[in-house]
């Protein structure tokens, strides 16, 4: 033979301002006879919610039908949540008394507490690009949440980063929290087309997290090799020198060549190709006039990337001497 | 229509124990409180306890705690009184009685009544 | 617990008498809590009136209950042969529901 019981499932109900919060309430028996009020808080001062018998309760609605026999669901709906709403919310059956009714049981209870959602992680980058095998810090904010509980995870590429510091502020009571996450993310030369995830989970989201990228294209630098080499055939007097930058990234790139220390002035042809992880082949051609005047060419390919201390790479010009009498043959 | 039907007279000896019956008909018997209700000869009515037989709950006079357990059957739409350590004060009629409705207390069906007597 | 008194215990009346007999509460009884039954002699009880002053199914319109608070009344506005029998008070306002003494109606 069982007692009846008092049953209201949720210990925390979370809502938002201006909605609609239900507060569930079923008992598990009719006896003994009487009815079931809603309170707010205990003890002498408590708010009476909902008294179905009697009192004004223009917010209050029942989600059962009272009037309906062996009813045993006394949930109900208030309207038009406000901050003064929050507290802790108890069904209370009681017993049909003389003079009064007498207090039977009460439910657990349910705390009705505001939620607000977080807002959308916004995260930012270092300010200034690095390069591979070195660490960048990326910052991971949102704001305005409640409760104050929240998870906050990072990825890169789709694998959890452990190398993070996360705080919570304020520390104590507030109507609204905010969250500061910094990862710390070393980068990989393949990282260009490599994302960085901060996912923030809270109850108010119903197991959708937020989530925030950055781009470590953004963070990254990826230096360029050089290699310059003389292409085996010439044409007519003309030697034909080959620049090649090979996987640089950001595109951003000033190539000049020099002959004997003397900058070139005139066009060169290029080409600029993408690699599959998004760093950049830049090749350059140098066509060099060769005279018999001319015994010792040097070619120097100088490349300044992305702003950074120009890097150049050097070639001793290889003319043999049949080159020459053929170019002597060429002179007017 | 609704009817109460109980069970016939008992003539126990004290000290024993005796279980008396009350079958429903003509309505859901599991939606409707049942209580029952003590009559000593030449006396009034003093109510015992009741129960819920949709949950098989019960509510007892505090007078009769101990004395009465009340009990109900939903296959067979019966609900028991059992009475124990029997004297003579237990001699009575007793009647099983149905509310109109959960929210109007008063005894709209009765039984018939069945008269215990308790004799050595 | 309530304590229902009812007076008188007895009355004899004639045939066509008006009859009035009363149920006093030891605690104030809402007037939708407040029942009238009658019982004769070998027979279980029948209602008579419910809720103060509403007449249960196929009770005559002679009846009548009246009151409030904690003090309630039954009225046979003429008395017929038939009406002999001893009628309770009941409450259903707080646990323990009980019942008054009675009043044996006992016609002349």
């Known amino acids: 033979e069982e007692e009846l019981q008092m049953i209201q499932p949720e210990k925390l109900l979370l809502v938002t301002v201006g909605k609609t919060a239900t507060l569930h309430c079923t008992v598990t028996s009719l006896l003994p006879v009487g009815p079931v009020l809603w309170f707010r808080g205990v003890g002498p001062g408590r708010e009476l919610i909902y008294n179905q018998k009697e009192g004004h309760f223009p917010r209050v609605t029942t989600v059962s039908d009272l009037t309906k026999r062996n009813n045993m669901d006394f949930s109900i709906r208030i309207s038009s949540i406000t901050p003064a709403d929050v507290g802790t919310y108890y069904c209370v059956k009681f017993r049909k008394g003389s003079p009064e009714n007498v207090e039977f049981k009460s439910g657990p209870g349910t705390e009705m507490a505001l939620g607000a959602k977080p807002s959308a992680p916004v995260v930012l980058g270092p300010a200034a690009r690095t390069t591979p095998e070195h660490t960048v810090s990326f910052t991971c904010e949102s704001h305005g949440f409640s409760p104050r509980d929240i998870t906050l995870k990072w990825f890169k590429n789709g694998n959890e980063l452990s190398d993070f510091q996360t705080n919570v502020d304020p520390t104590g009571q507030s109507v609204a929290y905010s969250i500061r996450s910094t990862a710390r993310v070393v980068l990989d030369p393949w990282d260009v087309r490599s994302q960085v995830i901060c996912e923030v989970a809270h109850v108010t989201l119903q197991g959708d997290p937020l989530r925030g990228t950055a781009n470590l294209s953004e963070a990254i630098r990826v230096p360029p090799t050089l290699e310059v080499t003389q292409q085996p055939m010439r044409v007519g007097n003309q030697v034909n020198v080959t620049c090649q930058v090979r996987k640089f990234y950001p595109q951003s790139l000033q190539l000049t060549w020099s002959e004997n220390g003397n900058v070139c002035q005139r066009e060169t042809a290029s080409t600029l190709t993408e690699n599959k992880d998004g760093t950049y082949n830049w090749t350059s051609w140098f066509l060099v006039n060769i005279s018999d005047q001319r015994d010792d060419v040097v070619l120097t390919c100088q490349v300044k990337h992305d702003g950074q201390l120009a890097v150049s790479k050097r070639l001793a010009l290889e003319v043999t001497v049949h080159q020459k009498d053929q170019s002597s043959d060429a002179t007017p | 229509q609704v009817q109460l039907q109980q069970s016939g007279p008992e003539l126990v000896k004290p000290g024993a124990s005796v279980k008396m019956s009350c079958k429903a008909s003509?309505?859901?018997?599991?939606?409707?409180?049942l209580s029952w209700v003590k009559q000593r000869t030449g006396q009034g009515l003093e109510w015992i306890g009741e129960?819920?037989?949709?949950?098989?709950?019960?509510y007892y006079n505090e007078k009769f705690k101990g004395k009465a357990t009340l009990t109900a059957d939903k296959s067979s739409n019966t609900a028991y009184i059992q009475l124990t350590s029997l004297t003579s004060e237990d001699s009575a009629v007793y009647f099983c009685?149905?509310?109109?409705?959960?929210?109007?207390?008063?005894?709209?069906?009765w039984g018939q009544g069945t008269l215990l007597t308790v004799s050595a | 617990e309530n304590v229902l008194t009812q007076s008188p215990e007895k009355m004899a009346v004639s045939l066509g008498q008006k009859v009035t007999m009363t149920c006093s509460a030891s605690?104030?009884?809402?007037?939708?809590?407040l029942h009238w039954y009658q019982q004769k002699s070998g027979a279980s009880p029948k209602p008579l009136i419910h809720?103060?002053?509403n007449l249960a199914s196929g009770v005559p319109a002679r009846f009548s209950g009246s009151g409030s608070g904690t003090s309630y009344s039954l009225t046979i506005s003429s008395v017929e042969a038939e009406d002999a029998a001893t009628y309770y008070c009941q409450q259903w306002s707080g646990y323990p529901w009980t019942f008054g003494g009675g009043t044996n109606l006992e016609i002349k």
């Open positions: 009685g149905r509310f109109y409705d959960y929210d109007g207390g008063w005894f709209a069906y």
């Open positions: 605690s104030s009884v809402s007037s939708s809590d």
């Open positions: 129960i819920y037989p949709g949950t098989i709950t019960t």
């Open positions: 003509g309505y859901t018997f599991s939606e409707y409180v």
């Open positions: 809720g103060t002053s």
